[in-house]
Amino acid sequence: LTCLGGFASPGPVPPSTALRELIEELVNITQNQKAPLCNGSMVWSINLTAGMYCAALESLINVSGCSAIEKTQRMLSGFCPHKVSAGQFSSLHVRDTKIEVAQFVKDLLLHLKKLFREGQFN
């Protein structure tokens, strides 16, 4: 049984842990940034809080070939209840308003830190 225990699938990650891990990943990105993140790619800005994880993923998923944010994209997909694909456009986005990926990641970090402090883990 002890040996078989290694094959058992771990239980679901608590939302607070998942959020903390996402925050840590964003901190890593912002602190380790040397050249312009994702070659200065632009993404849609967001103007609301409800459904924010999906909206953030919808913005970032349109950035391709940027390994620095691939982990963030995967982590955000864990918070979004539906499948997100490139080209989707949510009502949460500010139309005609794009910002640099680096700024978006920084802003997302700020927002998630607030949510964590307030105990809003979902």
Partner: nanobody, 118 residues
Framework: GVQLLESGGGLVQPGGSLRLSCAAS????????MGWARQAPGKGLEWVSV????????YYADSVKGRFTISRDNSKNTLYLQMNSLRAEDTAVYYC???????????WGQGTLVTVSS
């Protein structure tokens, strides 16, 4: 990059009203606490009013309570300051700024001059 552009300042008589606007761009405006600060001639910078990210809470300096109203429109990336019953001592350059209390997230506009004089 990040830009905060104030407008609406000008010359107004005591007792008059002005509405300042701040158009934000280059960052996720909706996720930031925002505020208005002012600097009167020969004086230091003081916070006039602050509004939380989704407008859930507001702060006003005692000197403007009951006269000034801060608001925001996240869909337009715009911050407002409605100033009523203006007094000579409200004369100052008014700055729009993020109000996160953290230098990492610190952004300021260039300011707009408000002059209250008869």
């Amino acid at each position: 990059g990040v830009q905060l552009l104030e407008s609406g300042g000008g010359l107004v008589q005591p007792g008059g009203s002005l509405r300042l606007s701040c158009a934000a761009s280059g960052f996720t405006f909706a996720w930031y606490d925002m505020g208005w600060a002012r600097q009167a001639p020969g004086k230091g910078l003081e916070w006039v009013s602050v509004i939380s990210d989704y407008g859930r809470g507001t702060y006003y300096a005692d000197s403007v309570k009951g006269r000034f109203t801060i608001s925001r429109d996240n869909s337009k990336n715009t911050l407002y300051l409605q100033m009523n019953s203006l007094r000579a001592e409200d004369t100052a350059v008014y700055y729009c700024a993020t109000a996160e209390g953290d230098d990492t997230f610190d952004y300021w506009g260039q300011g707009t001059l408000v002059t209250v004089s008869s």
